[in-house]
Interface confidence: low
Amino acid sequence: LIIGFGISGRHSITVTTVASAGNIGEDGILSCTFEPDIKLSDIVIQWLKEGVLGLVHEFKEGKDELSEQDEMFRGRTAVFADQVIVGNASLRLKNVQLTDAGTYKCYIITSKGKGNANLEYKTGAFSMPEVNVDYNASSETLRCEAPRWFPQPTVVWASQVDQGANFSEVSNTSFELNSENVTMKVVSVLYNVTINNTYSCMIENDIAKATGDIKVTESEIKRRSHLQLLNSKAS
């Protein structure tokens, strides 16, 4: 790819990306920022992917230029056009696929100079778990469910009262393939739970870590859940 802009003698500019993860089937964002320019017409943004011949996305002279876009990204990319002038070159990627994983380059040219930065983009599936009391069971049982995970995660139970306890002998985890034959539903059951305790169901793969907590007392049940993407780092 040859870019015919007279850029000799220009300074390099700072471009910053943040490694991130995409949830397959949903929209994702590849984050990239740069030193802003005064004129939108002087800014060129190119997104490239390692191993892909065509461009992922190009934005120049204030609009998208998609004549050299690779087929695998056709109709799935957009920049935040209203934010380019303030230095935001982030790319929105529609309907994230497993094959979108890889190394991307955010390449910027402005009147001040040029610069680029790489980012690692992981793809998989991750979702918030919900923990509920299973009233259908014969003994006090908790059921932790999360609808979409890939690759297959590990599931670990923990308890506030019995910190450090190993619950593998009193729990059972199953993975059920979803209809698209990639992601899986995670179901984990914990038996012999006690009242006045807080239990945590922790689901983790190499992309995300999620925790579903349930606090069971005689008078009420409280729940919370939290999802954290792993290995996000700026470059």
Epitope: D27, G28, I29, K215, R224, H226, L227, S232
Partner: antibody
């Protein structure tokens, strides 16, 4: 009514260690994340880190190597230590309570402590 | 980390007008973990909205929040004199917890 009251040194020299403490009056120390947030003069808010009643801490990666947050649950207090300060650490430092059971928001804040780092 | 970009940076309006403040996340945030705060000079921030759209205790109904995924909005239906302040969005769907850069709502 929950109140957070904070104190600590307001003037430091570069390379010194910032130390602030926040006391929690009213309400339980459990079920919450006890947090430190800072705001440089005229700028936005930056999360420093948090601790819960069982001592689990989470820190902002940008400050992790210099930050220690600890708690004394018997006194309903938690503290912040930030080592090797520079002028860039000059800010108003707030302690705050994050409710993780209900709304994942900071409902209660300390009054703020202006910490100035100057030689 | 999730970067929250707020725009506009400054909003110049008159009392009685409608204010629309935007917060865009660099990746999807569960609405459970998106909050809005108001801060006046010399004061600590005050929570207005949590869970993207639920008003905190004691917050007037002229404040409303909406949005999901990467785009969130705080709307003040009719600005009162006491509403002129700086507004921040905040997320904790992913660690580290992050705040937006803020939008200043000033009197025109």
């Amino acid at each position: 009514q929950v109140q957070l009251q904070q104190w600590g040194a307001g003037l430091l020299k570069p390379s010194e260690t910032l130390s602030l403490t926040c006391a929690v009056y009213g309400g339980s120390f459990s079920d919450y994340f006890w947090t430190w947030i800072r705001q440089p003069p005229g700028k936005g808010l930056e999360w420093i880190g948090e601790i819960n009643h069982s001592g689990t801490t989470n820190y902002n990666p940008s400050l992790k190597s210099r930050v220690t947050i600890s708690a004394d649950t018997s006194k309903n207090q938690f503290s912040l230590r930030l080592s090797s300060v520079t002028a860039a650490d000059t800010a108003v430092y707030y302690c705050a309570r994050l409710s993780s059971w209900s709304n994942w928001a900071f409902e209660y804040w300390g009054q703020g402590t202006l910490v100035t780092v100057s030689s | 980390e999730i970067v929250l970009t707020q725009f506009p940076g400054t909003l110049s309006l008159s009392p009685g007008e409608r204010a629309t403040l935007s917060c865009r996340a660099s990746q999807s945030v569960s609405s459970t973990y998106l909050a809005w705060y108001q801060q006046k000079p010399g004061q600590a921030p005050r929570v207005l909205i949590y869970g993207a759209s639920r008003r905190a205790t004691g917050i007037p109904d002229r404040f409303s929040g909406s949005g999901s995924g990467t785009d969130f909005t705080l709307t003040i239906s009719r600005l009162e004199p006491e509403d002129f302040a700086v507004y921040y969005c905040q997320q904790y769907g992913s660690s580290p917890l992050t705040f937006g850069g803020g939008t200043k709502v000033e009197i025109k």
